[in-house]
């Protein structure tokens, strides 16, 4: 008789999940020699241990602590780039500006980027059919808890001027319910962080509005100011030109506003 299996509303575990995590770990340590002390098999074992045999709506930050410990990494605290709803451009930026880091440029973020995973209570199986959706099923699912945990730690580590890239094409440029709005903003440490600088990325070619005046940006400013952190905001009118100028800052066209 086939075992009854919980059907969740979200997509199942990414195919080849164990192989992908292990391969990414090996790649990361090859690319970042300073992380060569990391034993990738132990990392996978700790990752697996966080969710295997556990109810996928009952995951806690504590479950991920062994993985967090193994993935401990020091990034320059004044070179942190946060992002919300504009991941690709943020990653293109740090690919060029090599001394800045998004969460996905760290080992743990790199391992899990774009992946989905969950297990089942009391069995060692990975569920490739479905996983809980944050809204429709439960918020304490393996993926959400992972990103909440690593995002909190990443924000806590930040210092001096912290940058955040925001998507100016969204109806809510700053969304209180995003990981940035619900986790990272509240875990920046006022005793370490002097300023949060928002870069609002414009989508339309002819969009010359000052999106720093958007009500949601004002809301972000208010939250940040109440936390005794200064706030500044810049419009990035031409993201393509912005990236080009990061690559070639001496280009004559890069002195004008981007």
């Amino acid at each position: 008789v086939p075992r009854w299996r919980q059907q969740w509303s979200g997509p199942g575990t990414t195919k080849r999940f164990p192989e992908t995590v292990l391969a990414r770990c090996v790649k990361y340590t090859e690319i970042h020699p300073e992380m060569r002390h990391v034993d990738c098999q132990s990392v996978w074992d700790a990752f697996k241990g966080a969710f295997i045999s556990k109810h996928p709506c009952n995951i806690t930050e504590e479950d991920y602590q062994p993985l967090m410990k193994l993935g401990t990494q020091t990034v320059p605290c004044n070179k942190i780039l946060l992002w919300s709803r504009i991941k690709d451009l943020a990653h293109q930026f740090t690919q060029v500006q090599r001394d800045m880091f998004t969460l996905e440029d760290t080992l743990l973020g790199y391992l899990a980027d774009d992946l989905t995973w969950c297990g089942e209570f009391n069995t060692s199986k990975i569920n490739y059919q479905s996983c809980p959706d944050w809204r429709k099923d439960c918020s304490n699912n393996p993926v959400s808890v992972f990103w909440k945990t690593v995002s909190r730690r990443f924000a806590e580590a930040a210092c001096d001027v912290v940058h955040v890239m925001l998507n100016g094409s969204r109806s809510k440029i700053f969304d209180k319910n995003s990981t940035f709005g619900s986790v990272e903003v509240h875990n920046l440490q006022p005793e370490k962080v002097q300023t949060l600088e928002a870069w609002v990325i414009h989508g339309g070619r002819e969009d010359s509005r000052d999106l720093c005046q958007d009500p949601t940006i004002k809301e972000l400013e208010s939250i940040i100011s109440k936390r005794n952190i200064q706030f500044s905001c810049k419009n990035i009118y031409r993201p393509d030109k912005f990236l080009q100028c990061v690559k070639n800052p001496e280009d004559s066209s890069c002195t004008s506003e981007i």
Epitope: R16, T20, A23, V26, K27, R36
Partner: antibody, heavy 120, light 107 residues
Framework: QVQLVQSGAEVKKPGASVKVSCKVS????????MNWVRQHPGKGLEWMGW????????DVAQKFQGRVTMTADTSTDTAYMELSSLRSEDTAVYYC?????????????WGQGTTVTVSS | DIQMTQSPSSLSASVGDRVTITCQAS??????VDWYQQKPGKAPKLLIY???NRYTGVPSRFSGSGSGTDFTFTISSLQPEDIATYYC?????????FGGGTKVEIK
């Protein structure tokens, strides 16, 4: 088993570009960083850079920056290395190479090499 | 960039001889040194990784030692099929760098 098969020999004129391909089998291209190494005739080995095919991220050795473009086509499990503004000193054998799981960070897997000759 | 100084650049030895090649790194590379064998017209072949670990299928006559800046590669009993050029390489720091090679010939 893991195999890296490179494109055939090329003869190019100075100033032209060359694009060398490296098709992999026995594993998924995105599961490993692909490195490129070149060797001048009768000389030593020179690392050119790597690409992470999963994200398209690259790291190119200083001396090749601005001239080398590394790309990957995950749909065909093929990595590419393009070298532009060719000069006679670029005459060499170009290899793709990757690490393995039980080889530290050495390269147990190599392509057979692609000979590029730059001559007017 | 880290320089890998390999010596000798060539050597001639008899079958059965013990052959030793050294490699010196210009700065500490821990044990992140690999040794390759290359025969004419062929791609290099990994023999030793992380200074002293023999790669799968490599005969036991090949060995390596060292850490920090000084490394040694040894063929305990030279065989005719060992005629090749041998390279050390450091994989500790980007960019990876290779030694200049040692050409091994039979007397």
């Amino acid at each position: 088993q893991v195999q890296l098969v490179q494109s055939g020999a090329e003869v190019k004129k100075p100033g032209a570009s060359v694009k060398v391909s490296c098709k992999v089998s026995g594993y998924t291209l995105t599961d490993s960083v692909m490195n490129w190494v070149r060797q001048h005739p009768g000389k030593g080995l020179e690392w050119m850079g790597w690409i992470d095919p999963e994200y398209g991220r690259t790291d190119v050795a200083q001396k090749f920056q601005g001239r080398v473009t590394m790309t990957a086509d995950t749909s065909t499990d093929t990595a590419y290395m393009e070298l532009s503004s060719l000069r006679s000193e670029d005459t060499a054998v170009y290899y793709c190479a990757r690490t393995g799981y039980n080889s530290g960070y050495g390269f147990p897997y190599w392509g057979q090499g692609t000979t590029v000759t730059v001559s007017s | 960039d880290i320089q890998m100084t390999q010596s000798p650049s060539s050597l001639s030895a008899s079958v059965g001889d013990r052959v030793t090649i050294t490699c010196q790194a210009s700065q500490n590379v821990d044990s992140d040194v690999d040794w390759y064998q290359q025969k004419p017209g062929k791609a290099p072949k990994l023999l030793i990784y992380k200074a002293s670990n023999r790669y799968t299928g490599v005969p036991s006559r090949f060995s390596g030692s060292g850490s920090g800046t000084d490394f040694t590669f040894t063929i305990s009993s030279l065989q005719p099929e060992d005629i090749a050029t041998y390279y050390c390489a450091q994989s500790n720091t980007h960019p990876r760098t290779f030694g200049g090679g040692t050409k091994v010939e039979i007397k």
